[in-house]
Interface confidence: medium
Amino acid sequence: MMTGTIETTGNISAEKGGSIILQCHLSSTTAQVTQVNWEQQDQLLAICNADLGWHISPSFKDRVAPGPGLGLTLQSLTVNDTGEYFCIYHTYPDGTYTGRIFLEVLESSVAEHGARFQIP
């Protein structure tokens, strides 16, 4: 029986050129997390495997940074980044838990907002 629940950052509005953090947390289960996949619609952004660590999809490696934790940082946002993002927790023995985040990227009228921040 799957007893876990996923809490997420929820719906986010951001400006073009900025950066956002996507975070999920799986609670209320003792299942072991073996891997977390981050997907945008049907596109794989990144994988965090318990044994192998992080893998960022080549098409996103310039704009996606792992962390904090099992979360994901998206940088240099474009309007095309608008849409649904999913954190998919692969666990044993429960199976798969999925959390959903909706991101809306808005046109920015302030050019200097494009600065990045660093995830240690």
Epitope: E7, T9, G10, I12, S13, G18, S19, I21, H25
Partner: nanobody, 115 residues
């Protein structure tokens, strides 16, 4: 008007403690993600800690076990308790909301760790 105002910074000796506050107005803190970031002179702004609505927290490796993030929904205020401070913690500390690093910044509060 939606606003975040940080306070609680100051000069402290190595090994000392400070508690930073981030007062929010214009939105309900309990319905949002909150985070603390910092920027040292000549460096990029970096993630320090964050907390989700339900209270789950994340920390940068450099502050784990020393810093604690929390939120008091009744006061619409987020906190960063900083213990065992080190000179390398010297920076301007900012809080942010909605997992969005410049969606809303306060003016920051300066923390200086020096003997």
């Amino acid at each position: 008007e939606v606003q975040l105002v940080e306070s609680g910074g100051g000069l402290v000796q190595p090994g000392g403690s400070l508690r930073l506050s981030c007062a929010a107005s214009g939105f309900t803190l309990s319905s949002n993600w909150m985070g603390w970031f910092r920027q040292a002179p000549g460096k990029e702004r970096e993630f320090v800690a964050s907390v989700l609505r339900g209270g789950y927290t994340w920390y940068a490796d450099s502050v784990k076990g020393r810093f604690t993030i929390s939120a008091d929904n009744s006061k619409n205020t987020a906190y960063l308790q900083m213990n065992s401070l080190k000179p390398e913690d010297t920076a301007v500390y900012y809080c942010a909301r909605d997992a969005y690093y410049y969606g809303l910044w306060g003016q920051g509060t300066l923390v200086t760790v020096s003997s």
